[in-house]
């Protein structure tokens, strides 16, 4: 049903009115306003921006806008004792030092409080030793080093290129390999698109540019000192030794000019194959240590950053629902940035601001949504999703009972090629239907729908004529809502052409060069892609908050469950002999998926036919839809990851950014051939199949007729 059938909505106040009110020029103006100075989490500047947003959201017409503060563990460089890396000679003299800061972009030379590049939460230390180049420091890279090349990283400083996987996973892998320090760098192969100039003349990373970022392995815990509970005034805090997810070895990021100086001297083993070579004019030798003439030289890290409990501020705005005020649709994105945040996060925050303004305009004209809409400006996302997680921990009882959906709103763009959507299968049909109604901003698709350009440029690998929609992973503020609480979630942004641009993320990610001018000059001068993303995000929120029947299709979950079951079965079948030996069967899982499919189909039929004028039945059906995502939550969580509780999806254990399906089974099967006790390992596989089958069956039963 269309939105304008909801209670007390005049024909004027429908989705079209909301979308028409969104203006590219406003998004541009908001982006400029949000990016003139740094807004690092825990700083006065970011507190002032929180208060500004609170004030403006009130002016826009929200019913209430409050600040929610928490005292969480953050990390900062020592202002008087900078972090750097040296090459030292046999006498211990520093003969080369990496740069202490990024050369500031034009127009920003006099800006104060630009935090120098650092790896947030690195411990202090000054390790020195031989260097080992470990490619991307992925699980498979360490397998190649240790198992195939017999190279031991124990007691070595490793240098890894950014990209492919979350930096925290790289550090964890290096720690497990016995390294005593990690140097992260941006290789031009991953952060320099051919044929494009470096900033300020283009959108590529200059040699002195460096990616900041946290290196935690929180696994959804939020504040490292208060896992599971809000970091409020009366919180009990763990000691730093018991803190969740902190790295144990020093880590520091550098740019490719500095990396060249370290890598050009590398000796030892040649790279195992061309996939280990980047684009620098260096041999990409693995090491350990430097080549002949330089073999007595070592690398020394100087890391003096400190971890500090610091106050952060979320801004929470409420637009009360007219009919179901106890049902919450949440639009949230973060406000804190590493430096100027030209893309991350302010291209998203500017879009949220304009969405709030549009909703506020409608509200001032007498309209209200059917359900309550909550708007959030999260703090400390860059330090481990802390603001969103602490707020969700504080409000978990309300959220698990009342949370309909969460739409994330970080960076609106990471390119300007086509749309990118990651969401729960429940939202597939919502996204399809919405994008069919929106105009494409793409060149060559004038007068065509967004759905059409998106499908053409990013086709689904499985279904012809449909666009690709990806699994949710993590690395952003939807994590606690989806992976811990089981609230249906989605995210949308404009992205690059993944086929022609193989660099990871966008080149200037988390660098000082992520400025307003980067967006205005190179990515989206007309702000038409930002406007499209605002229409997608805002349109999803509008429909979720306003449609009489929730716009969730449970049949799409049935389809993916079958696909995921097939996939995990085929992984297991790479070990046919062991499956036979240990009597491993997937019958229970396939049976549960079959039951889910049948029950979902019958539920969908009932959804078409029931009496929508009966508020009790309507509420009952909507609750079944709302609670379906919740039904995939296992209260015990995944093994060793208690805050990842979704049985169908979790962030990959090898890459936080990526989503893994049936993660419990997947992890049990991973590298199973190397396990010392195969009987125990296959026993765990069987247990995980049992948990997955039970959960799918239990979820199916929530869709059965209630009596």
């Amino acid at each position: 049903k269309s939105s304008n059938e909801a209670t007390n909505i005049t024909p004027k106040h429908n989705m079209k009115a909301f979308l028409d009110e969104l203006k590219a020029e406003n998004i541009k103006k908001f982006l400029y306003n949000f990016t003139q100075i740094p807004h690092l989490a825990g700083t006065e500047q970011n507190f002032q921006l929180a208060k500004q947003i609170q004030s403006q959201w009130k002016e826009f017409g929200l019913d209430s806008v409050e600040l929610a503060h928490y005292d969480v563990l953050l990390s900062y460089p020592n202002k008087t004792h900078p972090n750097y890396i040296s090459i030292i000679n046999e006498d211990g003299n520093e003969i080369f030092n990496t740069s202490l800061f990024e050369p500031p972009p034009p127009g920003y030379e006099n800006v104060s409080d630009i935090v120098p590049p650092f790896s947030a939460f690195s411990p202090q230390g000054m390790p020195e030793g031989d260097l080992v180049y470990v490619n991307y420091a992925r699980t498979e890279d360490f397998f190649k080093l240790e198992r195939d090349m017999k190279i031991n990283c124990s007691g070595k400083i490793v240098i890894a290129r950014y990209g492919k996987v979350f930096r925290g996973n790289k550090v964890k892998n290096a720690q497990l390999a016995g390294a005593k320090g990690v140097i992260l760098y941006s290789d031009p192969a991953d952060y320099f698109a051919p044929g494009v100039k470096s900033y300020p003349d283009g959108w590529n990373l200059p040699g002195g540019g460096v990616q900041r970022g946290n290196i935690l392995n929180l696994n959804g815990a939020g504040d490292p000192l208060t896992p599971g509970y809000p970091a409020n005034e009366y919180a009990y805090r763990r000691g730093i030794a018991e803190a969740v997810g902190l790295p144990s070895i020093p880590v520091h990021p550098i740019g490719y000019y500095d990396a060249q100086k370290l890598l050009e001297k590398m000796g030892g083993s040649a790279p195992p194959d061309s996939s280990w070579r980047g684009s620098l004019k260096v041999p990409y030798n693995v090491g350990p240590g430097f080549t002949g003439n330089f073999s007595t030289q070592k690398v020394k890290m100087h890391i003096h950053s400190t971890n500090e409990v610091t106050r952060i501020y979320n801004v929470i705005g409420t637009l009360r629902g007219a009919v179901e005020p106890d049902r919450y649709v949440i639009l949230g994105g973060h406000r804190d940035s590493w430096v100027f945040g030209g893309i991350d996060p302010q291209s998203g925050a500017a879009v949220v601001h304009e969405i709030v303004r549009s909703f506020g305009t409608l509200k001032k004209e007498g309209w209200r949504p059917r359900r309550t809409i909550l708007f959030a400006s999260w703090d400390a996302e860059e330090f481990g999703l802390l603001g969103s997680t602490e707020w969700a921990e504080e409000n978990s009882r309300l959220l698990q009972e009342r949370g309909v959906a969460y739409i994330n709103a970080d960076s609106s763009i990471e390119g300007n090629y086509t749309l990118r959507v990651d969401c729960t299968p429940l939202m597939y049909s919502l996204v399809h239907n919405l994008t069919k109604e929106l105009k494409s901003p793409d060149e060559g698709f004038e007068g065509k729908s967004l759905y059409e350009s998106w499908t053409k440029k990013s086709p689904s690998p499985e279904f012809s004529g449909m666009p690709r929609i990806s699994k949710l992973g993590s690395g952003n503020d939807f994590e606690v809502f989806f992976q811990r609480l089981g609230i249906a979630s989605g995210r949308a942004r404009y992205t690059k052409n993944w086929e022609t641009n193989k660099f990871s993320g966008y080149p200037l990610y988390h660098s000082v060069y992520e400025t307003y001018e980067l967006v205005e000059k190179f990515y989206d001068p007309m702000f038409k892609y930002h406007l499209t993303v605002a229409q997608v995000r805002g349109g999803m929120v509008f429909e979720l908050a306003n449609s009489i029947v929730l716009p969730f299709d449970c049949r799409d979950y049935a389809v993916v469950l079958r696909k995921y079951a097939d996939k995990i079965y085929s992984i297991s079948m790479k070990h046919p002999q062991e499956m036979k030996t240990y009597s491993v069967s997937f019958d229970s899982l396939f049976s549960a998926v079959k039951n889910f499919t049948e029950i979902a189909s019958k539920f969908s039929e009932r959804l078409q036919d029931f009496d929508k004028s009966n508020p009790i039945v309507l509420r009952m059906m909507n609750d079944q839809l709302m609670f379906l995502e919740r039904a995939f939550i296992d209260p015990l969580g995944l093994p060793d990851r208690p805050f990842y509780r979704h049985v169908i999806y979790a962030p990959s254990s090898h890459n936080k950014y990526a989503g893994e399906s049936f993660p419990g089974i997947y992890d049990a099967l991973f590298d199973i051939e190397s396990k010392v006790d195969p009987s125990k390992a296959w026993g765990e596989v069987k247990r995980q199949i049992y948990v997955a089958a039970f959960t799918v069956q239990a979820a199916a039963e929530t869709l059965s007729e209630v009596a």
């Epitope: 090459i87 003969i95 080369f96 030092n97 740069s99 050369p103 031009p188 320099f192 040699g207 002195g208 490719y256 000019y257 060249q260 100086k261 790279p271 061309s274 070579r277 980047g278 684009s279 620098l280 004019k281 260096v282 041999p283 990409y284 330089f294």
Partner: antibody
């Protein structure tokens, strides 16, 4: 605007040494190697070697080893090239040139050249 | 050392006509990372050399698009689509794949 400014012309006697300077501006000196290239009508352009200002590491062309010494002073962003035991065939224009680093890995900026005349 | 051989050594051209210079290296200039560090320099009369083309075919900033480079392995070409008066000078190919870096003998372009 990247600039390399070289010292003035030199006249030397055979067997003497000459030390040329190259002052860099408009960029971060320690990020880019400085090459020295000489030009004679007979030999054309000839790469003599290079220095990494960051760590002082040098790389010399075998043809000049034992006679050439490259140094740098990072405090004033200046590179130096000293050529000893001069011969008449060392008469040439000597250029310093910045090694452009990624993505170029070519000499992307050149000094104006210093004429060295070796004559008895 | 890698020997770079240019042909022709002298190239008289009519204004507006195309010009082509060849450069051959004594061994492959492909570096282990897959890139080929073959560069072209222009030296106008009385001036220092200036970078025109890097990595075989990439124009350096400010270089007009009438200049183009091509080739692979050991055989390379510099083309000028329509020669202008300011193009007069000596053109050098050079390799920075292997140490020592080496240059071709130069090709003198003059106007007929």
């Amino acid at each position: 605007q990247v600039q390399l400014v070289q010292s003035g012309a030199e006249v030397k006697k055979p067997g003497a040494s000459v030390k040329l300077s190259c002052k860099a501006s408009g960029y971060t000196f320690t990020y880019f190697d400085i090459n020295w290239v000489r030009q004679t009508p007979e030999q054309g352009l000839e790469w003599m070697g290079g220095i990494s200002p960051g760590d002082g590491n040098t790389n010399y062309n075998e043809n000049f080893k034992g006679r050439v010494t490259m140094t740098r002073d990072t405090s004033n962003s200046t590179a130096y090239m000293e050529l000893s035991r001069l011969r008449s065939d060392d008469t040439a224009v000597y250029y310093c040139a910045r090694d452009g680093n990624f993505p170029y890995y070519a000499m992307d900026s050149w000094g104006q050249g210093t004429t060295v005349t070796v004559s008895s | 050392d890698i020997v770079m051989t240019q042909t022709p050594l002298s190239l008289p051209v009519t204004l507006g006509d195309p010009a082509s210079i060849s450069c051959r290296s004594s061994q492959s200039l492909v570096y282990s990372n897959g890139n080929t560090y073959l560069n072209w320099y222009q030296q106008r009369p009385g001036q220092s050399p200036r970078l025109l083309i890097y990595k075989v075919s990439n124009r350096f900033s400010g270089v007009p698009d009438r200049f183009s480079g091509s080739g692979s392995g050991t055989d390379f070409t510099l083309k000028i689509s329509r020669v202008e008066a300011e193009d007069v000078g000596v053109y050098y190919c050079s390799q920075s794949t292997h140490v020592p870096y080496t240059f071709g003998q130069g090709t003198k372009l003059e106007i007929k």
